[in-house]
């Protein structure tokens, strides 16, 4: 199966052009949400709508792919858990962090467990 080339997409939308070179998705406001991706092929240019998810920081986007460890234990003090990601692949010109840390709130179930553990420790 042929893989999509970095920055290059065959056959742009509604076009006879052979190879379209697509830039990054640039949100219309701030650093996430709906935006546009510009493409060029010879003298032709096109803009297509795209979206950068708002729950990702910029370096977590399609430009940077990470391999993540399992989630750590719930921290009862902060009500969050953490996992680390190691860079797996970056778009050629993307300046990605080698490692990243992601936090998320614990589910009510794990939060309760963590609190119970914390309580036991105090006895």
């Amino acid at each position: 199966v042929a893989k999509k080339k970095d920055k290059v997409k065959k056959g742009g939308p509604g076009s006879e052009c052979a190879e379209w070179a697509w830039g990054p998705c640039t949100p219309s406001s701030k650093d996430c949400g709906v935006g546009f991706r510009e493409g060029t092929c010879g003298a032709q240019t096109q803009r297509i709508r795209c979206r950068v998810p708002c729950n990702w920081k910029k370096e977590f986007g399609a430009d940077c792919k990470y391999k993540f460890e399992n989630w750590g234990a719930c921290d009862g003090g902060t009500g969050t858990k953490v996992r680390q990601g190691t860079l797996k692949k970056a778009r050629y010109n993307a300046q990605c962090q080698e490692t990243i840390r992601v936090t998320k709130p614990c589910t009510p179930k794990t939060k309760a467990k963590a609190k119970a553990k914390k309580g036991k420790g105090k006895d």
Epitope: K3, D6, K65, T86, K88, A90, Y92, N93, C96, E98
Partner: antibody
């Protein structure tokens, strides 16, 4: 820090093939694009293509589409350049380099390929 | 493909002088332009990435400017070890291309 050690160069007859190796040591070989570049004697630098070890995605200079094949072996932390149907004008020093947009690149020492009968 | 034209082909300077090397792209390449130094028998060494970003371990006398189509590598005060060939390279689109090089030689 990544160290790249190249091997496989030498004297080869016209029409023959040759496989060059680029062995990486140090951090994260599989995370970065591996470029192959050549330099004919007394000439400038010419990009052959690149491959990403994580999924073997390959982007080849169309000039070399019938000449070069890129591959990787993650288990051996190595990248390979197979050159086919060699001609006198393929005589050059061949370099591999590991590219990260964030930290820059690391180059192998280069390996000389001489095509002559 | 994007053509990079370097000038001058040869630059003759004395140590201590300021060196200005030019690289012009055949079309806009944003800031996707890198500068390399190469000495005889050695692999190229990256000096500046993305037009003006410094590289760890490279002396501060090397600096770059851009973006767009016209790029400059400046060596504020040339040291004896700086005499070498300098190449620019673009990574804006495939194939990656290099300029023809500028040879910095001792006057």
């Amino acid at each position: 820090q990544v160290q790249l050690v190249q091997s496989g160069g030498g004297l080869v007859k016209p029409g023959h093939s040759l496989r060059l190796s680029c062995a990486a040591s140090g951090q994260s070989f599989s995370s970065y694009w591996m470029n192959w570049v050549r330099q004919a004697p007394g000439k400038g630098l010419e990009w052959i293509g690149m491959i990403h070890p994580s999924d073997s995605e390959t982007i080849l200079n169309q000039k070399f589409k019938d000449k070069a094949t890129l591959s990787v072996d993650i288990a051996k932390n190595s990248a390979y350049l197979q050159m086919n149907s060699l001609r006198a004008e393929d005589t050059a020093v061949y370099y591999c380099s590991s590219w990260s947009a964030k930290r820059g690149d690391f180059w192998g020492q280069g390996t000389l390929v001489t095509v002559s009968s | 493909e994007i053509v990079l034209t370097q000038s001058p082909a040869t630059l003759s300077l004395s140590p201590g002088e300021r060196a200005t090397l030019s690289c012009r792209a055949s079309e806009s390449i944003s800031n996707n332009l890198h500068w390399y130094q190469q000495k005889p028998g050695q692999a190229p060494r990256l000096l500046i990435k993305y037009a003006s970003q410094s590289i760890s371990g490279i002396p501060a006398r090397f600096s770059g400017s851009g973006p767009g189509t016209d790029f400059t590598l400046t060596i504020s005060s040339v040291e004896p070890e700086d005499f070498a060939v300098y190449y620019c390279q673009q990574s804006n689109s495939w194939p990656l291309t290099f300029g023809g090089g500028t040879k910095l030689e001792i006057k």
